[in-house]
């Protein structure tokens, strides 16, 4: 189920998954959540003189068990991912950080007026991911009231520095609060030939747009659907970016479909899951475990209830069903995504709701627990 | 056998192939000798096929293609299935064949020890599964007979993977959990050996298993210890010491 | 000897419900799975619906989901097809049947080797 | 689902005669397949089950074979009891399907 609470100078042994920098705990914690294995994350606030540079480091862990041996370690802060909370679970970050430089690749620098301006405008440009400002005190003069807009491969800053004057925070594109507006087309038999960012496998376009949403770098998207040609490239979902942040004309291509990020939508973002149920399809993974249901739709509760589980497959074969009902396979892989699609299976395939806002879950207040 | 390699001649000396005479003639099942006048293989061969003239039953042969009309091949006299087996249950999946003429037995052709009942809680660990089966669901019968070594499993976890079906303590479980390594068609009634103090003994029958060599879906064989009063009693009523028995 | 009796078929109007009953006998009843198979006149088998041997999982066939529920009294050797919103599309001799599940060819194999003699149900107005 | 397809739909054929009906499923079935007989007014009889293995007490004129796609049954020698109707079964996934039959009359 839900777990908030919060574990205070307290670190989590072992797990590790991924490191990243992020600016509190919270930021952590929401990182955790969307990352398609991460359970745990333990996050350094405080750290000794002699590692710096591991202050705000942002530890993501998983565990088979769903927990880990927890250390006493002053100034760490760890805790639980919120993957099943239902409407806790948000992309969306409004805090700003003052006396913190979010470190990354600084793309463009502007002059406004203040911290709000600069927000707007990170959350107004194609590759902004977070942002710097420098107010009037700043020690540097040619800096002062200067908005730097930031990316990084990772979408989180590359790395955190206390600096006086310096105030930063996180693009708003995911609080649906972007004017660029969003390109709901979707282009059948064509493909665009920009640079990829990353590839996934997905069973249609409408996953692969979904995924592409939420990725931090993908602006737009090819997927090949089950008939193209090339068999390594069938059901794979090629997520994309252009300098410009706009795709190149895109080129006619049979079983090809193609189409654009939903992050600068305000009204029609889906939400970070896939809710629909594919007939005759499976989706091959690692197995999680198997457990015998009566009918697909309780075999995608029982992934979703079950915190590791990403997607599963329900078996009509005889041989499949038991006197509980079919076979319910919950799998798991790196991305979260199927490692392979295949066609023509007895029975059907799907994902967890576990990231859906509308999975009910009970209510839970975040615990501060000093340990 | 998936996920087996070729056996040598004179390797699996007990191993029979079953066939069948009808148009043609084709390997069916596999069998183990266990006495000159005795083999003994799975009920569920004779399904739809219970008559002893049409079986033809080949020993001391590695290659199927050995098999000319000339290769002699021992006929069935009596055919002995199980009283409680039902076609529709697949339990008790176990059967004597008694042949007509007794065998000679050679280097390539000889019996395989029977288990004694004390040896129902055996822990064995070298164990080989043989036969001309499938080497993968949707293949074909092998030319030369195959061998595979599979761990056996517990009854237990046995029947957590086979959830509809009763695991009974008279059958006993065989597979990797990864799958890869099993019987399959063709090698049904054919020997699981296992070597124990020194000798092979015949510890199972091979009967059923769910597809060949699946991940976390053993194969399920006749644990022949469970069956040795039934067997002593089938084959002594026709003659004394007509076994080779491990206490023998 | 195996038998199936089926009963409960007759003449009932569309929107109406009816039940049918599958008494068995001469195997244990409570060991095998059973099905409904039903053959609109002078048309081809078209299976109904399925259950455990002890009635914790069904399976039913699209054209009856919601309408139709299979059930069984294993201390009564009976089976049971209640049919509600009957159609005239759902005229036709229902048959109970016996699944089998063998062994063949190293396989566990399912097959309905023993029917009832069938029960006509007709929808009309 | 899976579609069973049955050729032909009617057969002529005289005492003695070889006959052969052919089922084809839309997508493999491995063996998971079954014939059975039906005469006007009674229930369907099994005779194959697992594409090739007789029923016990089927006459043993009656074979099976095939198995993926591609299935057939055979009568060896046509007997006046076996003028009926023949449907195949997938027994491989839910929802179990039949084919539409084989009707075989006397020529």
């Known amino acids: 189920g839900c777990m908030t609470q919060l574990y205070k100078n307290t670190f989590f042994r072992g797990g590790d998954l991924a490191a990243i920098y992020t600016p509190d705990a919270q930021y952590c914690q929401k990182m955790c959540t969307f990352h398609p294995r991460c359970l745990l994350f333990s996050f350094l606030a405080v750290t000794p003189p002699k590692e710096t540079n591991k202050r705000f480091g942002c530890f993501m862990k998983e565990s088979i068990t769903g927990t880990l041996p927890r250390i006493h370690r002053t100034g760490a802060i760890s805790g639980h991912s919120l993957k099943q909370c239902g409407h806790q679970i948000s992309a969306c970050h409004r805090d700003i950080y003052k006396g913190l430089d979010m470190r990354g690749s600084n793309f463009n620098i502007s002059k406004t007026d203040n911290i709000e301006e600069c927000q707007k405008l990170c959350t107004n440009n194609f590759h902004c991911q977070f942002f710097t400002y420098a107010t009037s005190a700043f020690y540097r003069p040619e800096y002062r009231k200067k908005c730097l807009l930031k990316h990084s491969a990772s979408g989180t800053p590359t790395s955190i520095k206390s600096a006086d004057n310096l105030v930063s925070g996180f693009s708003l594109k995911s609080c649906a609060l972007s004017e660029i507006g969003c390109p709901m087309d979707i282009f059948q038999h064509s493909a665009f030939a920009d640079l990829n960012v990353s590839q996934v496998i997905t069973p249609d376009a409408f996953v692969c747009r979904t995924i592409c949403t939420f990725h931090p770098n993908c602006l737009f998207f090819t997927f090949y659907t089950n008939e193209w040609e090339t068999e390594s490239q069938r059901n794979v979902c090629f997520l994309k970016t252009s300098k410009s942040g706009r795709p190149s004309p895109p080129i006619p291509q049979e079983n090809a479909i193609s189409g654009y990020s939903l992050l600068t939508c305000r009204k029609t973002r889906p939400e970070p899951c896939h809710s629909k149920i594919y007939s005759g399809v499976d989706f091959e993974g690692e197995e999680l475990n198997v457990t015998f249901v009566q009918g697909a739709d309780v075999c995608q509760e029982t992934c979703t209830k079950t915190i590791r589980c990403q997607f599963f497959i329900y078996s009509l074969l005889p041989q499949d069903c038991k006197e509980e009902g079919c076979k319910c396979s919950l799998r798991l892989s790196t991305d979260g995504s199927p490692t392979r699609i295949t066609y023509g299976m007895q029975g059907s395939s799907g994902y967890s709701l576990r990231l859906c806002k509308l999975v009910d879950s009970p209510d839970c207040t975040t615990k501060i627990n000093a340990r | 056998i998936v996920g087996g390699t070729n056996a040598s001649l004179g390797e699996w000396p007990w191993q029979v192939s079953l066939q069948v005479k009808l148009v043609s003639q084709t390997h069916l099942c596999g069998g183990s000798i266990i006495g000159r006048q005795w083999v003994l293989t799975a009920a569920h061969c004779f399904d739809g096929i219970p008559y002893p003239d049409v079986w033809r039953i080949y020993g001391g042969i590695l290659s199927l293609s050995e098999i000319t009309k000339e290769t002699p091949s021992s006929r069935i006299k009596e055919l002995i299935i199980h009283q409680e087996y039902k076609v529709s249950e697949g339990n008790y999946d176990i059967a004597l064949i008694k042949l007509q003429t007794p065998l000679n037995y050679t280097e390539f052709q000889k019996p395989i020890c029977l288990p004694s009942k004390a040896d129902t809680n055996t822990i064995y660990t070298n164990c080989w599964v043989t036969g001309w089966g499938y080497t993968k669901e949707q293949g074909e019968t092998q030319n030369i007979l195959q061998k595979a070594t599979i761990p056996l499993v517990p009854n237990e976890e046995c029947q957590k993977k086979y959830r509809d079906y009763v695991i009974n303590k008279q059958m006993i479980c065989a597979g990797y959990k990864e799958g890869g390594t099993d019987a399959c068609k063709g090698d049904s009634g054919g020997p699981l050996v296992c070597k124990h103090s020194g000798r092979w003994q015949l510890v199972g029958i091979t009967s059923w298993g769910e597809g060949c060599g699946r991940k976390d879906q053993p194969g399920v064989y006749t644990k022949v210890s469970e069956y040795m009063d039934w067997i002593l009693e089938k084959t002594q009523s026709s003659d004394v010491r007509a076994l080779e028995t491990s206490s023998a | 000897e195996v038998q199936l009796l089926e009963s409960g078929g007759g003449l009932v109007q569309p929107g109406g419900s009816l039940r049918l009953s599958c008494a068995a006998s001469g195997f244990t009843f409570s060991h095998y799975l059973m099905t409904w198979v039903r053959q609109a006149p002078g048309k081809g088998l078209e299976w109904v619906s399925y259950?455990?041997?002890?009635?914790?999982?069904?399976i039913y066939a699209d054209s009856v989901k919601g309408r139709f529920t299979i059930s069984r009294d294993n201390s009564k050797n009976t089976l049971y097809l209640q049919m509600n919103s009957l159609r005239a599309e759902d005229t036709a001799v229902y048959y109970c049947a016996r699944v089998a599940r063998g062994i063949a060819a190293r396989s566990r194999t399912s097959y309905f080797d023993y029917w009832g003699q069938g029960t006509l149900v007709t929808v009309s107005s | 689902d899976i579609q069973m397809t049955q050729s032909p739909s009617f057969l002529s054929a005289s005492v003695g005669d070889r006959v052969t009906i052919t089922c084809r499923a839309s997508?493999?079935?491995?063996?998971?397949l079954a014939w059975y007989q039906q005469k006007p007014g009674k229930a369907p009889k099994l005779l194959i089950y697992a594409a090739s293995t007789l029923q016990s007490g089927v006459p043993s004129r009656f074979s099976g074979s095939g198995s993926g796609t591609e299935f057939t049954l055979t009568i060896s020698s046509l007997q006046p009891e076996d003028f009926a109707t023949y449907y195949c079964q997938q027994l491989n996934s839910y929802p179990l399907t039949f084919g539409g039959g084989t009707k075989v009359e006397i020529k």
């Open positions: 997508q493999g079935i491995s063996s998971y």
């Open positions: 259950i455990s041997p002890s009635g914790g999982h069904t």
